[in-house]
Amino acid sequence: HNTTVFQGVAGQSLQVSCPYDSMKHWGRRKAWCRQLGEKGPCQRVVSTHNLWLLSFLRRWNGSTAITDDTLGGTLTITLRNLQPHDAGLYQCQSLHGSEADTLRKVLVEVLADPLDHRDAGDLWFPGESESFEDAHVEHSISRSLLEGEIPFPPTS
């Protein structure tokens, strides 16, 4: 599997999409996991609804949400309020029994918030009547890793 890079800005939301063959993965729940080291296990962060029919309902673990368009064949993961510690290698998985197929390997990169260096007077905050949901923008800049690029820093 190639690794796709998704870049997001610290403090904002990052949306990761994982396309898949909807027929091949029909009836299967999906999951988002974090790779622990280059050869380590992939630790489950969040999985889709326990009922495959209801995979369109968002399921959360902390600030990470997952939802699955099972007809269109797109798994979407939202990392809200992205933090530097969220950077790393992840996988979108399709579950069957105790097995998991990798749909996509994802490298999440967290960029510094350019607003951090501005005068606080320039910052915009949502008004009382506006919900946080309407205020935040979900960014995702993605690219594939170039051949020879390493998603983990080399260990000494």
Epitope: R29, L51, F56, R58, W60
Partner: antibody
């Protein structure tokens, strides 16, 4: 605090439609799906369906397909359910209930209910 | 469809007594993800249902520790260790492993 405020009681004629509302407050509306539940003397509690407040996708209990239509208005944090071609069988209390997709995985908060009476 | 059968239909108790309600499912509610999707709700007179217990044995926030849930597979039990006047009402079990189904309810009332 989390609140689900439902519209008031309805007294309607057979054959017409009615649309009831459920306004969520005290939480981020689009983070939680919304269920609708019917309570009648004959059948205790029956699940009607669920709607994603985020995507507006729905799933209905087979029994209520063609009878109930669920919608959401994100801008007002309100979920709606329309009941069509009403008969006396539809006389009941209808509840909206929030779906907790975080860790509880259940209907964690309920509206106060909307009474629908179908009578000529 | 999954059917949840609650017993008894009516449970007369004295304040301070222990109460036990059974809920049996026609199919196992254990999911492949390891969770068992069985909850308990209480509907007090004139009120909406309220969540008591989720995923078999977890008390929802604010629910007193006199309420406990247990069971596995198809057989589940809700116990109230010392019934108080505010506990009176109708108790429903509920499953979300095969879409959604409520039990028929058990009315807890004073003897």
């Amino acid at each position: 605090q989390v609140q689900l405020q439902q519209s008031g009681p309805e007294l309607v004629r057979p054959g017409v439609s009615v649309k009831i509302s459920c306004k969520g407050s005290g939480y981020t509306f689009t983070d939680y799906a919304m269920h609708w539940v019917k309570q009648s003397h004959a059948k205790s509690l029956e699940w009607i369906g669920v709607i994603s407040t985020y995507s507006s996708n729905t799933n209905y209990n087979q029994k209520f397909k063609g009878k109930a239509t669920m919608t959401v208005d994100k801008s007002s944090s309100t979920a709606y359910m329309e009941l069509a071609r009403l008969t006396s069988e539809d006389s009941a209390i209808y509840y909206c209930a929030r779906d907790d997709g975080h860790y509880v995985y259940a209907m964690d908060y309920w509206g106060q209910g909307t009474s629908v009476t179908v009578s000529s | 469809d999954v059917v949840l059968t609650q017993t008894p239909l009516s449970l007369p108790v004295n304040i301070g007594d222990q109460a036990s309600i059974s809920c049996k499912s026609t199919k196992s509610l254990l999911n492949s993800d390891g969770f068992t999707y069985l909850d308990w709700y209480l509907q007090k007179p004139g009120q909406s249902p309220q969540l008591l217990i989720y995923l078999v044995s977890n008390r929802f926030s604010g629910v007193p520790d006199r309420f406990s849930g247990s069971g596995s597979g198809t057989d589940f039990t809700l116990k109230i260790s010392r019934v108080e006047a505010e506990d009176l009402g109708v108790y429903y079990c509920f499953q979300s492993n095969y879409l959604y189904t409520f039990g028929g309810g058990t009315k807890l009332e004073i003897k």
